[in-house]
C-alpha cells in the first residue's frame, strides 16, 4: 500500500494535471498558450 508521501491533495503524485488551454488573442487565428504539465 502507498504511504502518505505518495499523495498530494488526495491524488497520486504522478497524475498529470490538465489546464484549460488559453487563447489570449480571442477571435484571431492563434495557437494556445503552452502550459507545463505538473507531475
Amino acid at each position: 500500500s502507498y504511504s502518505m508521501e505518495h499523495f498530494r491533495w488526495g491524488k497520486p503524485v504522478g497524475k498529470k494535471r490538465r489546464p484549460v488551454k488559453v487563447y489570449p488573442n480571442g477571435a484571431e487565428d492563434e495557437s494556445a498558450e503552452a502550459f507545463p504539465l505538473e507531475f
Epitope: W9, K11, R17, R18, P19, V20, K21, V22, Y23, P24, N25, G26, A27, D29, A32, E33, F35, E38
Partner: antibody, heavy 115, light 110 residues
C-alpha cells in the same frame, strides 16, 4: 474572424432533454481546441459545465454536470454539442459556449425548464 | 474540487476611484487564474489570464496579481465604461473539476 454561435435553447418540461449546438466559424475545430460550456442562471453568476478537447475528443466535466450532461463534437459540421438530460427547473439559464480561456464566446442561448 | 471565493460581492465606487477585487482559491492553483468583465445581456470578456497578463486591447488601468491561492484584480482609476460585473476563474485542472468561477463582483456607481 472566429465566431461561435449557440442554438437549440427553448422551453422544456422538467425531466425532459435538450441538445444545444455551438457552431464554429473562422477556425477548424478538429485542429484541437478546448471548447467549453458555461451557464448563467437569471441574475446569477457564471457556472462552468465542462469542456471538450476537439482534437482528441476527450471531455471534462464539473462534478455538478457529470451524469446528466454530455459534450460532443461533429468535425464534419464544425459544431459542438451539449446534450442535457433529466432537466430540472434549476437548469434554467443562458448557456454559452466558449473557446477555452478567451474572449471568444457565443451570444448564449436561453434554456427554460418549466411545466 | 477547487472552490473560488470572490469578494466583495458588490462594490460601490465613483469615477476615478481605485478599485480592488480579491479572489481566493481553496487550494493552490499556481498562476492559472483569469479575470472576466461582463455587462448585462452580454457574454463575458477576458481581461487578464495567467493571473497578471493583460489581454490585447484591455486598458492598462486594469492589472492582476497573485499566485498560489490569493489573487487581486485592480482598476487604478475607474472609468464610466468599467461599471460591470467581474468574475475570476481558475483553469488549473479540468480533469479534476478545476475550472471554477468565483461568485462575481458587481461594480456599481456610488
Amino acid at each position: 474572424q472566429q465566431q461561435l454561435v449557440e442554438s437549440g435553447g427553448g422551453l422544456v418540461q422538467p425531466g425532459g432533454s435538450l441538445r444545444l449546438s455551438c457552431a464554429a466559424s473562422g477556425f477548424t475545430v478538429s485542429s484541437g481546441y478546448d471548447i467549453c460550456w458555461v451557464r448563467q442562471a437569471p441574475g446569477k453568476g457564471l457556472e462552468w459545465i465542462g469542456c471538450i478537447d476537439t482534437g482528441s475528443g476527450n471531455t471534462y466535466y464539473a462534478s455538478s454536470a457529470k451524469g446528466r450532461f454530455t459534450i460532443s463534437r461533429d468535425n464534419s459540421k464544425n459544431t459542438l454539442y451539449l446534450q442535457m438530460n433529466s432537466l430540472r427547473a434549476e437548469d434554467t439559464a443562458v448557456y454559452y459556449c466558449a473557446k477555452g480561456i478567451s474572449s471568444l464566446w457565443g451570444q448564449g442561448t436561453l434554456v427554460t425548464v418549466s411545466s | 474540487d477547487i472552490q473560488m471565493t470572490q469578494s466583495p460581492s458588490t462594490l460601490s465606487a465613483s469615477v476615478g476611484d481605485r478599485v480592488t477585487i480579491t479572489c481566493q482559491a481553496s487550494q493552490t492553483i499556481s498562476s492559472d487564474l483569469a479575470w472576466y468583465q461582463q455587462k448585462p445581456g452580454k457574454a463575458p470578456k477576458l481581461l487578464i489570464y495567467a493571473a497578471s497578463k493583460l489581454t490585447s486591447g484591455v486598458p492598462s488601468r486594469f492589472s492582476g496579481s497573485g499566485s498560489g491561492t490569493e489573487f487581486t484584480l485592480t482598476i487604478s482609476s475607474l472609468q464610466p465604461d468599467d461599471f460591470a460585473t467581474y468574475y475570476c476563474q481558475t483553469y488549473y485542472d479540468i480533469s479534476d473539476d478545476g475550472a471554477t468561477f468565483g461568485g462575481g463582483t458587481k461594480v456599481e456607481i456610488k
